[in-house]
């Protein structure tokens, strides 16, 4: 066929129509052609590109009894739930023998109420703290103008006059609702309503007021909480774990924390039942009727040392002439700190008391003055830490040494000539 005669020879007797509608619409485009001989497969084009995954059906009706007679071929393209990506120019394409034929175009357009691409989301914010909300809508038809509403009250005089995609809120002191309206030539669509819950601000200046071996007193400054009074504050303490280390931003402690509630005011709390001479991390959050604030950062604190809670154990004292042999074991009761040593005191019936610092040894040999005839000699031992002396043991009488008894080998400790302190009994 001559190169310029294609249009006249077109087999198409029905071209696609036009569809214009709102999102979600279902519609059908239809092509009809009349051909001689075997009917061809009809392909659909959108904006000049073959649709690889077209929802199309093809019906073929013979107009005669012979296979070489004419056929009517109808192809229908179904568009389900119309979207912006479906819009464009549609045509049918067929290959007949060695020739290509394209139908006249039809158009699919989208026109309706604005469609939200982004809507404001529920969120929590600290009182008097700035934040942003987002809203985005599109047509067609364009333009789409937005109007923000706070607690159902418009924030601008007319659509398009106030903030558009992003609304900056400098801060709230009460829980509020926000929505946005999208306006175009077809009408108005309203977004979901976002609830912005106002929580107390994070407490500030968490600090230690006083320390004792088993308790810490802490205080803090509450943050603003809007129109909602604080109902209580919650303090958490956790044993510091050198292996893990609680970083300032770490969301959760490495073990189950000790939790205490404080009624407010005052913004102060005494934490008891702690271990002495132990590092802790503490944090605080305050709660109103709307919910809790965020936690403060973890604050490292430490309980101070205490004195040992019990005397040394299993004290034995034996005498052999002018020498006395004393030994003992570490207290079973908590030391409440680092053991620095032991103090030992002994006294005879009519002699002054003698106090000695033994250091960390748990046995000592005493060189008694005179011929060793001092009667009713008794010995007491106490453990001590940096915080001071623990309780003294009950007086232990010095027993005569019997052959076969073990005897510690230690340098002799000479008895000082003057008493150093008054007796604990």
């Amino acid at each position: 066929a001559p190169r310029g005669t294609q249009a006249e020879e077109s087999p198409f007797v029905g071209n696609p129509g036009n569809i214009t509608g709102a999102r979600g619409l279902t519609g059908t485009l239809r092509c009809q052609l009349q051909v001689q001989g075997e009917p061809p497969e009809v392909h659909w084009l959108r904006d000049g590109q073959i649709l690889e995954l077209a929802d199309s059906t093809q019906t073929q009706v013979p107009l005669g009894e012979d296979e070489q007679d004419d056929w009517i071929v109808v192809s229908q393209l179904r568009i389900t739930s119309l979207q912006l990506s479906d819009t464009g120019q549609y045509q049918c394409l067929v290959f007949l023998g060695h020739q290509t034929f394209v139908s006249q175009p039809g158009y699919v357009g989208l026109e309706g109420l604005p469609y939200f691409l982004e809507e404001p989301e529920d969120r929590t914010v600290a009182a008097n703290t700035p934040f942003n909300l987002s809203c985005q809508a599109q047509g067609p038809p364009e333009p789409v103008d937005l109007l923000w509403l706070q607690d159902a009250v418009p924030l601008a005089t007319a659509p398009g006059h106030g903030p558009q995609r992003s609304l900056h809120v400098p801060g709230l002191n009460k829980t509020s609702s926000f929505s946005c309206e999208a306006h175009n030539a077809k009408g108005v669509t309203t977004s979901r309503t976002a609830t912005i819950t106002v929580l107390p601000q994070q407490p500030r200046n968490l600090h230690l007021v006083s320390r004792q071996p088993t308790e810490l007193e802490v205080a803090w400054t509450p943050g603003l909480s809007g129109i909602y009074p604080l109902t209580h504050c919650t303090l958490q303490a956790v044993l510091s774990d050198d292996g893990m280390g609680i970083q300032a931003g770490e969301p959760d402690p490495p073990e189950e924390p000790l939790t205490s509630q404080a009624s407010v005011p005052p913004h102060q709390l005494r934490l008891g039942s702690l271990h002495p001479h132990t590092p802790y991390h503490i944090r605080v959050a305050c709660t109103s009727s709307q919910g809790p604030s965020s936690w403060t950062h973890w604050l490292p604190v430490e309980t101070p040392e205490g004195v040992p809670l019990g005397p040394p154990e299993n004290i034995s004292a034996t005498r052999n002439g002018s020498q006395a042999f004393v030994h003992w074991q570490e207290p079973r009761a908590p030391l409440q700190g680092t053991l620095l040593g032991y103090r030992l005191a002994y006294q005879g019936q009519d002699t002054p008391e003698v106090l000695m610092d033994i250091g960390l040894r748990q046995e000592v040999t005493l060189e008694l003055q005179g011929d060793g005839s001092v009667s009713n000699l008794t010995v007491c031992v106490a453990a001590y830490t940096a915080a001071g002396d623990g309780p003294w043991s009950l007086p232990v009488p010095l027993e005569a040494w019997r052959p076969g008894q073990a005897q510690p080998v230690h340098q002799l400790v000479k008895e000082p000539s003057t008493p150093a302190f008054s007796w604990p009994w």
Epitope: R3, G4, Q6, A7, E41, H43, L45, D47, G48, I50, E52, G88, Q89, Q91, L93, F95, H98, Q99, T100, V102, Q104, P105
Partner: antibody, heavy 118, light 112 residues
């Protein structure tokens, strides 16, 4: 009769821009892609890009993305290619061609000879 | 991008001889939906626009002499001129339109 008409020649100075035209007739202009092809003297054919007049959708050869801009005017059934920041390397014959979906017939314009010279 | 390679780049033959030229693509040009190979052969004479000879790899364009034959499928294609005539002096280009357009570098046919 399908025709693609192009001006025979254009003379422009280096650094300037030029808009080449391709006027279509004899068929439904909005239904077929228009392609642009460059041929430097004594060289082969280089596809530059194409445009679908129905939607103004375009594709470009990466090599010509910052050099060429394709547009159409549906009311006059004319396709345009604007070439910017011209140098002597842009001196060539530029053809427009209609793509019949990989089939027959396809039609080519006669080409516009662009000379970039001061 | 699809790359098209043509060989040889030139050849000289006497009138009446048979000539074949090759075109290879970097990926298959067979569209499984339309069941067609989107490869075309063009002839360009000096000072003229390219003229379509073959499309769909093997379909001869209307008015093209039957001494021109296209063959091949997928990635390997051949243009054969069964008996070269003096007027066949030209450059021959293959072109893929499977994905946009890409031309081969051309084969220059000279007559001895």
């Amino acid at each position: 009769q399908v025709q693609l008409q192009q001006p025979g020649a254009e003379l422009v100075k280096p650094g300037a821009s030029v808009q080449l035209s391709c006027k279509a007739s004899g068929y439904t202009f909005i239904s077929f892609w228009i392609n642009w092809v460059k041929q430097r003297p004594g060289q082969g054919l280089e596809w530059m890009g194409n445009i679908f007049p129905g939607s103004s959708s375009t594709n470009y050869n990466e090599k010509f993305k910052s050099k060429a801009t394709l547009t159409v005017d549906k009311s006059s059934s004319t396709a345009y290619m604007q070439l910017s920041s011209l140098t002597s390397e842009d001196s060539a014959v530029y053809f427009c061609a209609r793509d019949y979906y990989g089939g027959s017939p396809d039609y080519w314009g006669q080409g516009t000879t662009l000379t970039v010279s001061s | 991008d699809i790359v098209m390679s043509q060989s040889p780049s030139s050849l000289a033959v006497s009138a009446g001889e048979r000539v074949t030229m090759s075109c290879k693509s970097s990926q298959s040009l067979l569209n499984t939906r339309t069941r067609k190979n989107y490869l075309a052969w063009y002839q360009q004479k000096p000072g003229q626009s390219p003229k379509l000879l073959i499309y769909w790899a093997s379909t001869r364009e209307s008015g093209v002499p039957d001494r021109f034959t296209g063959s091949g499928s997928g990635t390997d294609f051949t243009l054969t001129i069964s008996s070269v005539q003096a007027e066949d002096l030209a450059v021959y280009y293959c072109k893929q339109s499977y994905n946009l357009w890409t031309f081969g570098g051309g084969t220059k046919l000279e007559i001895k």
